[in-house]
C-alpha cells in the first residue's frame, strides 16, 4: 500500500468507505419512496491522520495549520471522493416513477 | 438569505470561508517556494448544522443518520465546493518557475 | 437463502382468467418490489408490471392495462398476479422476480409458472 | 418506452472461445443494463447489474461494460455451462424492457 493509504492509527480507523444499513424511515424519506425500503448507504466514516488519502494541496495545507493552531484549524476530513448512482422508485403526481441520484452512495473517500 | 445559509447556531459558527495568515514555514513550504513569504490562506471552517449549506443528498442522510447513530455516523463536515488558483514562484531543477496550484485556496464552502 | 417459489401449471380457456401466485421467503418482503415477466414459448422476456408489498403502489405495462391485476398478501409475503380475458397468445410462463434494488438490480427470480390457454 | 437491442441474435462459438454480445438502448439509461442467462426450462439468472457489477456467485470470466446507450457482455473464455440465451434488460425508466436475446450454440 501506498504512504497515503496505511492508517498509522491502526487498522479500519482511518478515512475509508463504511456501509450503514438504512431504512427510509432513518433517512426521512419513507413519505415519498416506494422501494426498496431498506437502502445500504455507503459513506465515508474515520480519521484523517497527516498524508493519510491527502484529496490536493488544500488539504496538506489544512493538516499543517492545524498543527500549529488545532483551536482554529480543523484537522482534514473524511468525505467522498466521488459517488455511485443508485435508484429509486418514487411516488410522482403521475404515478411511480424509477428515478437516478447520482450524489447518494459514496464510492471512494478521501481526506480534505 | 435561502434557509440552508442562516446559521442557527449564532453569525460565524457555522460552515463558511475563513482566512488564515500563514507563513511559508507555517505551510512546510520554505524549502521550496521563494515567493510570496506569506500567504492568505482561504478555509472551510464551521459547524454543520441540519439543512445548512448541504453539498447533495449525501449530506442530508449523512445528518440523518448522524443523529440516529452520532457515535457511528458523524456529522456532515465543512469543505470547500472549489477553489480559487494561486500563483506560486518556486525553485526548480534549472532555476524559478511561476506556478500555478488550482486546489489550494478554497473559494465556498459547502457541508458533505 | 432467498427464494420466490410460484404455484404450478394452469390450463385455461380462452376469456378466462388465471391467477398465479409467488411466496418470497429469506428477506423481508415489503422492503422490495416484485415484478411479473413473462415468456411465451420461444421467444423472449416481456415485463408485464411491477407491485410494491408495502404500499400496494403498482405499474403496469401498457399493452396489458385493464387486463391484469397485482396484488399481496404481506400476512404469507405473498404476491399475486391475476390475467383476465385470457387469449391464446397469453400462452406463456410467468415469472416472478424480487426488485428493482437500490442499483436498478432484479436480482431473485421464481421458478416460473406455465399458463397455457386453449379451447 | 426504451427499445433494447441486442446483437448477434446468435453465436455459434467453441469452449475457451471469447465472446461478445452487445445491447444498445434507443435512450440513455445511464447505468442501469442488466444481463441475465437463461436456459432451457429454467428461470433467468442475474449475471451483471448496473452495467459492471458481477452478481454474487457468477464466474469472473463474465463481465459487462458500457453506459449511457451502448452496452458489451463478454465472456473471457467460454465454457461448457455457458451455452445458453443471454439477455439484456433496463432498469432505468418504467416499463423495464429487455432485449431480443442472444443464442450462444457450439460451433
Known amino acids: 500500500a501506498r504512504n497515503g493509504d496505511r492508517c498509522p492509527l491502526g487498522p479500519g480507523r482511518c478515512c475509508r468507505l463504511h456501509t450503514v444499513h438504512a431504512s427510509l424511515e432513518d433517512l426521512g424519506w419513507a413519505d415519498w419512496v416506494l422501494s426498496p425500503r431498506e437502502v445500504q448507504v455507503t459513506m465515508c466514516i474515520g480519521a484523517c491522520p497527516s498524508q493519510f488519502r491527502e484529496a490536493n494541496m488544500h488539504a496538506q495545507i489544512k493538516m499543517n495549520l492545524h498543527r500549529l493552531k488545532p483551536d482554529t484549524v480543523p484537522a482534514p476530513c473524511c468525505v467522498p471522493a466521488s459517488y455511485n448512482p443508485m435508484v429509486l422508485i418514487q411516488k410522482t403526481d403521475t404515478g411511480v416513477s424509477l428515478q437516478t441520484y447520482d450524489d447518494l452512495l459514496a464510492k471512494d473517500c478521501h481526506c480534505v | 438569505a435561502r434557509n440552508g445559509d442562516r446559521c442557527p447556531l449564532g453569525p460565524g459558527r457555522c460552515c463558511r470561508l475563513h482566512t488564515v495568515h500563514a507563513s511559508l514555514e507555517d505551510l512546510g513550504w520554505a524549502d521550496w517556494v521563494l515567493s510570496p513569504r506569506e500567504v492568505q490562506v482561504t478555509m472551510c471552517i464551521g459547524a454543520c448544522p441540519s439543512q445548512f449549506r448541504e453539498a447533495n443528498m449525501h449530506a442530508q442522510i449523512k445528518m440523518n443518520l448522524h443523529r440516529l447513530k452520532p457515535d457511528t455516523v458523524p456529522a456532515p463536515c465543512c469543505v470547500p465546493a472549489s477553489y480559487n488558483p494561486m500563483v506560486l514562484i518556486q525553485k526548480t531543477d534549472t532555476g524559478v518557475s511561476l506556478q500555478t496550484y488550482d486546489d489550494l485556496l478554497a473559494k465556498d464552502c459547502h457541508c458533505v | 437463502q432467498v427464494q420466490l417459489v410460484q404455484s404450478g401449471a394452469e390450463v385455461k380457456k380462452p376469456g378466462a382468467s388465471v391467477k398465479v401466485s409467488c411466496k418470497a421467503s429469506?428477506?423481508?418482503?415489503?422492503?422490495?418490489?416484485i415484478n411479473w415477466v413473462r415468456q411465451a414459448p420461444g421467444q423472449g422476456l416481456e415485463w408485464m408490471g411491477w407491485?410494491?408489498?408495502?404500499?400496494?403502489?403498482?405499474v403496469y405495462a401498457q399493452k396489458l392495462q385493464g387486463r391484469v391485476t397485482m396484488t399481496t398478501d404481506t400476512s404469507t409475503s405473498t404476491a399475486y398476479m391475476e390475467l383476465r380475458s385470457l387469449r391464446s397468445d397469453d400462452t406463456a410462463v410467468y415469472y416472478c422476480a424480487r426488485g428493482p434494488g437500490q442499483y436498478a438490480d432484479v436480482d431473485v427470480w421464481g421458478q416460473g409458472t406455465m399458463v397455457t390457454v386453449s379451447s | 418506452d426504451i427499445q433494447m437491442t441486442q446483437s448477434p441474435s446468435s453465436v455459434s462459438a467453441s469452449v475457451g472461445d471469447r465472446v461478445t454480445i452487445t445491447c444498445r438502448a434507443s435512450?440513455?439509461?445511464?447505468?442501469?443494463l442488466a444481463w441475465y442467462q437463461q436456459k432451457p426450462g429454467k428461470a433467468p439468472k442475474l449475471l451483471i447489474y448496473?452495467?459492471?457489477s458481477l452478481q454474487s456467485g457468477v464466474p469472473s470470466r463474465f463481465s459487462g461494460s458500457g453506459s449511457g446507450t451502448d452496452f458489451t457482455l463478454t465472456i473471457s473464455s467460454l465454457q461448457p455451462e455457458d451455452f445458453a440465451t443471454y439477455y439484456c434488460?433496463?432498469?432505468?425508466?418504467?416499463?423495464?424492457?429487455f432485449g431480443g436475446g442472444t443464442k450462444v450454440e457450439i460451433k
Open positions: 435512450q440513455g439509461i445511464s447505468s442501469w
Open positions: 448496473a452495467a459492471s
Open positions: 407491485i410494491t408489498a408495502y404500499s400496494g403502489d403498482t
Open positions: 429469506g428477506y423481508t418482503f415489503t422492503d422490495e418490489g
Open positions: 434488460q433496463q432498469a432505468n425508466s418504467f416499463p423495464i424492457t
